[in-house]
């Protein structure tokens, strides 16, 4: 039950981008695929009211008339549990300069719902995607990205925030999920595993991929992230799976080659602007979409997730660099930073293409379980 391999004409990143559809039956999850805790690693750095931003924080995505002290992505407080994790994995996020903040961590106590009640919500992320159960929705048009090809200057902030590596994006990166569903990109970050252990957040028919990229967007209907949190469609995340391929991905290398500089938790560097769209699959027309949540506290719901069907290819060395370079909290390796998949609880994952037909010989026609969520927007 795997989708047919896609023959891509113009591979991303100098020939090492995603040619493959993210399905495979030979790689079903083992017990080691994710940490045993209910809420293993994951990260979406978002702002909270008690944490006013410093100069170094993400540029505002807001009208020019907005007051100066407004909140920015990355400013939400996070919560850390005492004690050490049972497994050698990432736990707390502790900036060297900001020990006065509260923090969350992966594994152990307290459970995330105690950190943020929304983490016990019914519509959480990530989820396991089963293409043959996805509802084909013709109304889901190809994604539109505008302004993602950034010039080298101004440079962008690349930061090891203790639970991921995050690239802060400048104003002007516009994304449309469809007519009237417009967003501005705020930041991107990655999730990964460890040696021999995949670390994507979403899974496909139980298959966990080596890594996953998230590009986080704020709806143009909101001036600030804190206003959008928990509001349906207030935030949107584009997600793509990263897989091992034979060649180096030149787009990703522009970031991965700089990880050594930010190995220490809380450290950051400036990197030249790059083509952000080159970090994503080239096929913007085939994707899965559902409404979920942030994958870490505060776990706010109402987030529109768009998961590309096509994967992005990185070399084995690049994936190794990603999982093996950074230090996280508690003086441990920054690894396995993904959350366990969460129950759908009746949600239907939509597909922009007839995924059920391609992925299963038993499926005779596209599954049309309900009307498209996107229809009529």
């Amino acid at each position: 039950q795997r989708l047919p391999r896609m023959q891509e004409d113009s591979p991303l990143g100098g020939g090492s981008s995603g040619e493959d559809d993210p399905l495979g039956e030979e790689d079903l999850p083992s017990e080691e695929d994710s940490p045993r805790e209910e809420d293993p690693p994951g990260e979406e750095d978002l702002p909270g009211e008690e944490d006013l931003p410093g100069e170094e924080d993400l540029p505002e995505v807001k009208p020019k008339s907005e007051e100066e002290g407004s909140l920015k992505l990355e400013d939400l407080p996070t919560v850390e549990a005492p004690g050490d994790p049972q497994e050698p994995q990432n736990n707390a996020h502790r900036d060297k300069e900001g020990d006065d903040q509260s923090h969350w961590r992966y594994g152990g106590d307290p459970p995330w719902p105690r950190v943020s009640p929304a983490c016990a919500g019914r519509f959480q992320s990530p989820v396991d995607i089963r293409p043959q159960l996805a509802a084909f929705c013709p109304a889901l048009r190809p994604l539109e990205l505008l302004g993602f090809q950034l010039p080298p200057l101004p440079e962008l902030r690349l930061r090891n925030n203790g639970h991921s590596v995050q690239l802060t994006l400048p104003p002007g990166l516009e994304m449309a999920l469809g007519p009237g569903r417009e967003y501005r990109a705020l930041q991107l970050h990655l999730h990964w595993g460890a040696a021999g252990r995949p670390g994507s957040e979403h899974t496909v028919e139980g298959h966990r991929f080596p890594a996953e990229i998230h590009v986080v967007h704020l709806s143009t209907a909101f001036a600030r992230v804190d206003e959008a949190l928990g509001r349906p469609g207030g935030l949107a995340v584009l997600a793509a799976f990263l897989e091992e391929g034979p060649e180096e991905n030149s787009a990703y290398e522009q970031l991965l080659s700089r990880l050594e500089e930010i190995a220490e938790e809380g450290s950051e560097t400036q990197v030249p602007g790059l083509d952000i769209s080159a970090l994503l699959p080239s096929d913007f027309s085939r994707y899965f979409q559902y409404e979920g949540s942030l994958t870490t506290p505060p776990c706010a719901q109402g987030v529109i997730w768009t998961v590309f069907n096509q994967t992005v290819m990185l070399s084995a060395k690049q994936l190794h660099t990603l999982s093996d370079t950074l230090w996280g909290p508690g003086d441990s390796r920054l690894q396995l930073n993904f959350r366990a998949t969460q129950p759908l609880n009746g949600r239907v994952i939509e597909a922009s293409f007839p995924a059920g037909v391609d992925s299963s010989p038993r499926a005779a026609e596209p599954v049309q379980l309900n009307s498209c969520l996107a229809a009529g927007d």
Partner: antibody, heavy 118, light 107 residues
Amino acid sequence: QVQLQESGPGLVKPSETLSLTCTVSGGSISSYYWSWIRQPAGKGLEWIGRIYTSGSTNYNPSLKSRVTMSVDTSKNQFSLKLSSVTAADTAVYYCARLITGPYGMDVWGQGTTVTVSS
Amino acid sequence: DIQMTQSPSSLSASVGDRVTITCRASQSISSYLNWYQQKPGKAPKLLIYTASNLRGGVPSRFSGSGSGTDFTLTISGLQPEDFATYYCQQSYSSLFTFGPGTKVDIK
């Protein structure tokens, strides 16, 4: 090939500051982590700390309050300062280069002996 | 801090012998363990990194294995130049720690 050479006074008085410099030759100091390790006579190895060429540091907690590391990329050098020394700081001090990922030390200086005595 | 222990602390062996040195971590360190050889009056030399990867130029008689908390360095046929002290070092924690060393001398 890259070579490392430690230099500094071989004798330091108690309560004073030990200062050592490691000079990197045969290659650039840039884009690497560099480390200091010490070894008291007849004893094992103790990691002191590391520094990246950007100046980012990480120190052994047992020495953190007394250690300062710095880097001078223009001179291809990095240095160690250890304040308020006592006789327990008498050791052979090594500088070494770290391999990112495994974080093993693949190139070492020959070591310099520092004695703390009045 | 992660504590590292080695056993034995010393051993006597003959040329040609198979020698096994064990290193144990106080908590799981995955495969983040490096092995060094140090001869008297010399700096340590990296032999094996991440538990089992032989560094270039190191003879193939040296091998490493293990993961989690228990690791082994094996010298399959001891040579005269192998008489030295061997140290393990963990790099799972960013606060690196070494084992106390195992001295291999001539029987």
